[in-house]
């Protein structure tokens, strides 16, 4: 039975030309991480895999750093970069988890951090 | 040497899941060098990637066939295996599973040829 | 996705001739670790394919070598230098840099 709960940054806003880190947090089970993937609709962004490190798509090669820990910076940002962001969490028994943010990158100076919340 | 195998139906009827798998011989899944693929060929035509699966559970699929794909291993088997459901006569193809190579270095890893190929059995979706 | 389109569609040689195939990406397969991962393989009638080439030009254990492959960026060939009549089949390209891994539309090669 899957028992655990992500945890993400939620709805996110952002500065033309910043970055941003992407975080979720998988919690509430005992279960082993064996990767996570970053995706951007259907867009693959990264792969963090407990055993061979990181894999990073290259079209965004030169915009997206590993980490903090499981999570993913996004750097220079557009407009473009506007939309949902999923990380995929591949456990062990349990199965897969899917946590969810949404990225708004605005062009003022007004970008504010979204409230955290939980995905079942 | 390593062998792949396939085995499954070789008739599957509309809106049913297709199930196959790949018994790997000659070595061993729980090998951290190595990427486990499946990939599709239609009639006459070229080849598909469906996705991939490593030996501790993580996997990726092609975009394009996501939302039906499921890729699962079985280390105490040696075997890994592919969920394809809502069948319809455009999944009527050879399928065949591969293993692929893995780079890592610094941190990173990368993915390289297939090597090793099952013989693939014919799917079709008829009722 | 990476697209990748071979020409010539289909190719008839004369044994002993050389042959030559063409693979072009749609986005460079620039590597991030001084290796670009483009592979060449064979697909003989009635069997799976088998690799010929990875990493655009290491020849894979027992490949002979009158088949070499090379190219950057976005353009790759796979030659063969003296067709012989174990050679027909269809031949195709696959990139892996980048998920989903893409095979261009293959090449059959034909002996005259």
């Known amino acids: 039975m899957m028992t655990g709960t992500i945890e993400t940054t939620g709805n996110i806003s952002a500065e033309k030309g910043g970055s941003i880190i992407l975080q979720c947090h998988l919690s509430s089970t005992t279960a082993q991480v064996t990767q996570v993937n970053w995706e951007q609709q259907d867009q693959l962004l990264a792969i963090c895999n407990a055993d061979l490190g990181w894999h990073i798509s290259p079209s965004f090669k030169d915009r997206v750093a590993p980490g903090p820990g499981l999570g993913l910076t996004l750097q220079s940002l557009t407009v473009n970069d506007t939309g949902e962001y999923f990380c995929i969490y591949h456990t062990y028994p349990d199965g897969t988890y899917t946590g969810r943010i949404f990225l708004e990158v605005l062009e003022s100076s007004v970008a504010e951090h979204g409230a955290r919340f939980q995905i079942p | 040497q390593v062998q792949l195998q396939e085995s499954g139906p070789g008739l599957v009827n509309p809106s049913q899941t297709l199930s196959l798998t790949c018994i790997v011989s000659?070595?061993?899944?729980?090998?951290?060098?190595?990427?486990w693929s499946w990939i599709r060929q239609h009639p006459g035509k070229g080849l598909e990637w469906i996705g991939y699966?490593?030996?501790?559970?993580?996997?990726y699929y092609n975009p394009s066939l996501k939302s039906r794909v499921t890729i699962s291993v079985d280390t105490t088997k040696n075997q890994f295996s592919l969920k394809l459901s809502s069948m319809t006569a455009a999944d009527t193809a050879v399928y065949y599973c591969?293993?692929?190579?893995?780079?890592?270095?610094?941190?990173?890893?990368?993915?390289?040829?297939?090597?090793?190929w099952g013989q693939g059995p014919t799917v079709t979706v008829s009722s | 996705e990476i697209v990748l389109t071979q020409t010539p569609l289909s190719l008839s040689v004369t044994p002993g001739q050389p042959a030559s195939i063409s693979c072009k990406s749609s986005?460079?397969?620039?590597?991030?670790?001084?290796?670009?991962?483009l592979s060449w393989y064979l697909q003989k009638p009635g069997l799976p394919p088998q690799v010929l080439i990875y990493?655009?030009?290491n020849r894979f254990s027992g490949v002979p070598d009158r088949f070499s492959g090379s190219g950057s960026g976005t353009d790759f060939t796979l030659k063969i230098s003296r067709v012989e009549a174990e050679d027909v089949g269809v031949y195709y390209c696959?990139?892996?840099?980048?998920?989903?891994?893409?095979f261009g539309g293959g090449t059959k090669v034909e002996i005259k």
């Open positions: 986005q460079s397969l620039l590597p991030s670790d001084g290796k670009t991962y």
């Open positions: 000659g070595g061993s899944i729980r090998s951290g060098d190595y990427y």
């Open positions: 591969a293993r692929g190579s893995i780079a890592a270095r610094s941190g990173y890893f990368y993915f390289s040829g297939l090597d090793v």
């Open positions: 699966i490593y030996y501790s559970g993580g996997t």
């Open positions: 990493e655009v030009s």
């Open positions: 696959m990139q892996s840099i980048q998920l989903p891994l893409t």
